[in-house]
């Protein structure tokens, strides 16, 4: 039975041209994290494999940086970066946990972080 929960940074906003950290945290389980995938809609941004380390998609190397931790940093944000982001935790023996973050990239300087929320 999957007992864990994913805590994410929830709905967040950031300024165009700026940077943002996408963070997820898996809790309430003793399962071993073997890999974390970061996706934007259906596009792969990065993989952090427990044995092999980080793989940053060649399509995003200019604007994506690994970390901190299992998180992901998006740089040089554009309005086209607005949308859903997913952290997909592959664990043993539980299986897969998915967290969702919605990022809104704003033209103005009115960019405030939203509250955290959990996805079981």
């Amino acid at each position: 039975m999957m007992t864990g929960t994913i805590e994410t940074t929830g709905n967040i906003s950031a300024e165009k041209g700026g940077s943002i950290i996408l963070q997820c945290h898996l809790s309430s389980t003793t399962a071993q994290v073997t890999q974390v995938n970061w996706e934007q809609q259906d596009q792969l941004l990065a993989i952090c494999n427990a044995d092999l380390g980080w793989h940053i998609s060649p399509s995003f190397k200019d604007r994506v940086a690994p970390g901190p931790g299992l998180g992901l940093t998006l740089q040089s944000l554009t309005v086209n970066d607005t949308g859903e982001y997913f952290c997909i935790y592959h664990t043993y023996p539980d299986g897969t946990y998915t967290g969702r973050i919605f990022l809104e990239v704003l033209e103005s300087s009115v960019a405030e972080h939203g509250a955290r929320f959990q996805i079981p």
Partner: antibody, heavy 118, light 113 residues
Framework: QVQLVQSGAEVKKPGASVKVSCKAS????????ILWIRQAPGQGLEWMGD????????NYNEKFQGRVTLTADTSSSTAYMELSRLRSDDTAVYYC???????????WGQGTLVTVSS | DIVMTQSPLSLPVTPGEPASISCRSS????????????LAWYLQKPGQSPQLLIY???TGESGVPDRFSGSGSGTDFTLKISRVEAEDVGVYYC?????????FGQGTKLEIK
């Protein structure tokens, strides 16, 4: 030890399709990308595309977009490259190779010669 | 697309002598986040599949003789063979794996004088 074993040589007519297989062993198949590289006779190396069996993510060289399809069967640790609407200039040796992020293409298959001739 | 340009295209070398191959990319291959260059060198011996010699521009692949070394950063890279041996003949390729589509140099054919 790590091995990538490809299917045998093929002879095809123009307009036909070919499907080349690449069976992986000696490592966790779902951890590494499988890239497909081709080499025309006496020519250099050309990247066609790649697939990540751990998530079925794919990327294609625009030159081949619409003609090449990459798939992977995790149950048999086998990757496939299908090239359709073959032309004579598709005559080449096709290689599969594994890759992960920083480490480049560290193991290669033996290559599969595909000859397109009427 | 990133264009990879190698020189020379042909390299006759006397056994025991050093050899050097240059590779230039049309864009920087340095990833700022880890300060690594996504540049690899391969050797394709006659009738064989290519084999990886160097990744990250300067890190030798396991099992590759230490007479092979890579250097450079950004857009200019070099593969050096300290003392060429007969078994080193073949075509040497540089390749960028920084961004799609991955691209290769034209190849440098090393032959024994």
């Amino acid at each position: 030890q790590v091995q990538l074993v490809q299917s045998g040589a093929e002879v095809k007519k123009p307009g036909a399709s070919v499907k080349v297989s690449c069976k992986a062993s000696g490592y966790t198949f779902t951890n590494y990308w499988i890239l497909w590289i081709r080499q025309a006779p006496g020519q250099g190396l050309e990247w066609m595309g790649d697939i990540y069996p751990g998530g079925h993510y794919t990327n294609y060289n625009e030159k081949f977009q619409g003609r090449v399809t990459l798939t992977a069967d995790t149950s048999s640790s086998t990757a496939y490259m299908e090239l359709s609407r073959l032309r004579s200039d598709d005559t080449a040796v096709y290689y599969c190779t594994r890759y992960y992020g920083p480490y480049a293409m560290d193991y290669w298959g033996q290559g599969t010669l595909v000859t397109v001739s009427s | 697309d990133i264009v990879m340009t190698q020189s020379p295209l042909s390299l006759p070398v006397t056994p025991g002598e050093p050899a050097s191959i240059s590779c230039r990319s049309s864009q920087s291959l340095l990833y700022n986040s880890n300060q690594k260059n996504y540049l690899a060198w391969y050797l394709q011996k006659p009738g064989q599949s290519p084999q990886l010699l160097i990744y990250w521009a300067s890190t030798g692949e396991s099992g590759v003789p230490d007479r092979f070394s890579g250097s450079g950063s950004g857009t200019d890279f070099t593969l050096k063979i300290s003392r060429v041996e007969a078994e080193d003949v073949g075509v040497y390729y540089c390749q960028q794996y920084y961004s799609y589509p991955f691209t290769f140099g034209q190849g440098t054919k090393l032959e024994i004088k």
